[in-house]
């Protein structure tokens, strides 16, 4: 693979991470293919430092993150660990909601307009994160 | 300049594989994307594959999901699509192109276009 | 998928003339389109993208308008050198696809 020492143009760098933000919104699993065509990934938020990051770049708009239940339990794109992992939910989040009329449940995790978790229908086209580590050699993506 | 050569085309019987190359040259290869997209004779434009810039990535149309793979040697500034179980819908002009940076076309965009190389699957 | 639907399939117009051509998508696709030129032989050229750009070194005469899913395409003096199938595309989402042409010729 190739090894990546900068950040690419129009990326943000952060603690040794390469940050792209959107200008429009796509389904999820649009939004993930995008990210990985960059060879990058959905944003995994590991801190609440980092939380603050990124929420501070995407202001008070619905935006994707690399985090989903769609197989069961939740997972990070990256397959960072979930249950021993950071979490910023909204309160009573996740709910995998029914009742928005739109066929299943709610299997994707955003930031909403105060920067704290939900999660939603995927199909729904929200900005999305990018997020790809320095001086780390690239890799096939982890299956979903 | 900015250019890309295909090569590798040819008339090969159904059932049987073709190897497609593309090579580029006057830009850094390995910071851009590319495709393949294909013509059939007296038709329209049919995307064909993506693969991001480090390989890592790909994805396919469904029309040959399973019997095309689209990959890069970017030590050789190359592109290539292995074409296997050729039927006869896949005679067309197979054309490179590349993906223009994301810093100047969010999105899948395409700019540069090769010449084409003409694949003919018929017995 | 995104279906892309070009209209006219093909027009005659004299030289001097305005040129239109429209292009609906299936769905949104904001400003991810592209429009090309395709002579006979030739591989397709990017005339204008992001909907409305003009590529480097295209004339002045070609412009695109649209968001969202109904796009335009102008020639606004049509050239005998426009002779050429046209073709609108959107990059929004996968797979990409692509208008089914727009075959321009001269009166």
């Known amino acids: 693979g190739s090894e990546r020492t900068c950040c690419p143009v129009n990326w943000v760098e952060h603690e040794r991470s390469c940050y792209w933000f959107s200008r429009s919104g796509k389904a999820w699993a649009d939004a993930d293919n995008y990210c990985r065509l960059e060879d990058a990934h959905l944003v995994v938020v590991t801190s609440w430092e980092e939380q603050k990051f990124v929420q501070h770049h995407i202001g008070p708009v619905n935006t994707w993150m690399g985090l989903h239940d769609q197989n069961g339990p939740w997972k990070w794109v990256d397959g960072t660990d979930y249950e021993t992992g950071f979490k910023n939910w909204r309160p009573e989040q996740p709910d995998d909601w029914y009742g928005h009329g739109l066929g299943g449940g709610e299997d994707c995790a955003h930031f909403t307009d105060d920067g704290r978790w939900n999660d939603d229908v995927c199909q729904r086209p929200y900005r999305w994160v990018c997020e790809t580590e320095l001086d780390k050699a690239s890799q096939e993506p982890p299956l979903l | 300049q900015v250019q890309l050569v295909e090569s590798g085309g040819g008339v090969v019987q159904p059932g049987r594989s073709l190897r497609l190359s593309c090579a580029a040259s006057?830009?850094?290869?390995?910071?851009?994307?590319m495709h393949w997209v294909r013509q059939a004779p007296g038709k329209g434009l049919e995307w064909v594959a993506i693969i991001s810039y480090a390989g890592s990535t790909k994805f396919y149309a469904d029309s040959v999901k399973g019997r095309f793979t689209i990959s890069r040697d970017n030590s050789k500034n190359t592109l290539y699509l292995q074409m296997n179980s050729l039927r006869a819908e896949d005679t067309a002009v197979y054309y490179c192109v590349r993906r223009p940076p994301q810093w100047l076309v969010e999105g899948y965009g395409m700019d540069v276009w090769g010449q084409g190389t003409t694949v003919t699957v018929s017995s | 998928d995104i279906q892309m639907t070009q209209s006219p399939s093909s027009l005659s117009a004299s030289v001097g003339d305005r040129v239109t051509i429209a292009c609906q998508a299936s769905q949104d696709i904001s400003n991810y389109l592209n429009w090309y030129q395709q002579t006979p032989g030739k591989a397709p050229k990017v005339l204008i993208y992001?909907?409305?750009n003009l590529e480097t070194g295209v004339p002045a005469r070609f412009s695109g308008s649209g968001s969202g899913t109904d796009f335009t395409f102008t020639i606004s003096s049509l050239q005998p050198e426009d002779i050429a199938t046209y073709y609108c595309?959107?990059?929004?989402?996968?797979?990409?696809?692509f208008g089914g042409g727009t075959k321009v010729d001269i009166k």
């Open positions: 992001d909907a409305s």
């Open positions: 595309q959107q990059y929004d989402n996968l797979p990409l696809t």
């Open positions: 006057g830009f850094t290869f390995s910071s851009y994307g």
